[in-house]
């Protein structure tokens, strides 16, 4: 299995945005790579987003995806937006080398993303 490294913990911003780097130990230069972010919470695993990219090109997530990202060599910089406290959980980076063959799969240990909902602003008399 291909080694995938990602940070253990990330704290989302007050605007509900979390970014982390997913690095994979590629055996060479895959021309087509698929990156999937999985969320594990309460022993349930769900797919958050996925993108396939050609080496040297940008990651393209679906238009309605909460993820964006960029790639550089064997690193993928992932950003997840619109997070709320209930989205706190372990976010796992899965990398697949799709082409050329053979197929390689790597799954990271996960990044624990903590999301704290901002305190509502008190009403102002001004």
């Amino acid at each position: 299995a291909m080694h995938v490294a990602q940070p253990a913990v990330v704290l989302a911003s007050s605007r509900g945005i979390a970014s982390f780097v997913c690095e994979y130990a590629s055996p060479g230069k895959a021309t087509e790579v698929r990156v999937t972010v999985l969320r594990q919470a309460d022993s349930q695993v769900t797919e958050v987003c996925a993108a396939t990219y050609m080496m040297g090109n940008e990651l393209t997530f679906l238009d309605d995806s909460i993820c964006t990202g960029t790639s550089s060599g064997n690193q993928v910089n992932l950003t997840i937006q619109g997070l709320r406290a209930m989205d706190t959980g372990l976010y796992i980076c899965k990398v697949e080398l799709m082409y050329p063959p053979p197929y390689y799969l790597g799954i990271g240990n996960g990044t624990q993303i903590y999301v704290i909902d901002p305190e509502p602003c008190p009403d102002s008399d001004f």
């Epitope: 590629s26 055996p27 060479g28 230069k29 895959a30 050329p100 063959p101 390689y104």
Partner: antibody, heavy 118, light 107 residues
């Protein structure tokens, strides 16, 4: 376990064509990866010669391109090197090796010594 | 072609020593660098790939670091079986190229 094994004549005369074969066991050369030839003159460094891909594609080192052909026999799971117009400078240990596309070499043959001499 | 300049070309050390071998690429190769160990009459064996990842079965005393143009192989505590020749290799760009090698000898 993947294994690669080179075979060849050992001695070739100057101006003749060198022919070497690499037999692969434990993995089909058409399933994936790139299948390479690398050489090493005595006491010197390694020089990549070229590859044949799982799909039959080739790429050769520009420094040797005019003299090199790498082909395969999929029925025998073998790939071969032909190097034409050899000179004493082609005397070396020749290795076959496997890599992912533009990747490091994870499996190697044990090498076969090729001497160019009249 | 990308030149891989390896230094030193030879090195004398003792069992237990910490040893560092360096490799400089003539242009940026990212993290696409591997290191191999070769003993006389044998094929090279992969030690490190993708700059810093140990190949399967390679002892933890071997480590790699660097990026861009400067790369290092470190052996933290030399063992008797480590006396051999070491090569760096860039696989960022074809034609694939190797360093000239570092011969590690017993002092």
């Amino acid at each position: 376990q993947v294994q690669l094994q080179e075979s060849g004549p050992g001695l070739v005369k100057p101006s003749e064509t060198l022919s070497l074969t690499c037999t692969v066991t434990g993995y089909s050369i058409t399933s994936g990866y790139y299948w390479n030839w690398i050489r090493q003159p005595a006491g010197k460094g390694l020089e990549w010669i070229g590859y044949i891909g799982y799909d039959g594609s080739n790429y050769y080192n520009p420094s040797l391109k005019s003299r090199v052909t790498i082909s395969r026999d999929t029925s025998k799971n073998q790939f071969s090197l032909k190097l034409s117009s050899v000179t004493a400078a082609d005397t070396a240990v020749y290795f076959c090796a496997r890599n992912y596309y533009s990747g490091y070499f994870d499996f190697w043959g044990q090498g076969t010594t090729l001497t160019v001499s009249s | 072609d990308i030149q891989m300049t390896q230094s030193p070309s030879s090195l004398s050390a003792s069992v237990g020593d910490r040893v560092t071998i360096t490799c400089r690429a003539s242009q940026n190769v990212g993290t696409y660098v591997a290191w191999y160990q070769q003993k006389p009459g044998k094929a090279p064996k992969p030690l490190i790939y993708s700059t810093s990842y140990r190949y399967s079965g390679v002892p933890s005393r071997f480590s790699g670091s660097g990026s861009g143009t400067d790369f290092t192989l470190t052996i933290s505590s030399l063992q008797p079986e480590d006396f051999a020749t070491y090569f760096c290799h860039q696989y960022d760009t074809y034609p694939l190229t190797f360093g000239a090698g570092t011969k590690l000898e017993l002092k």
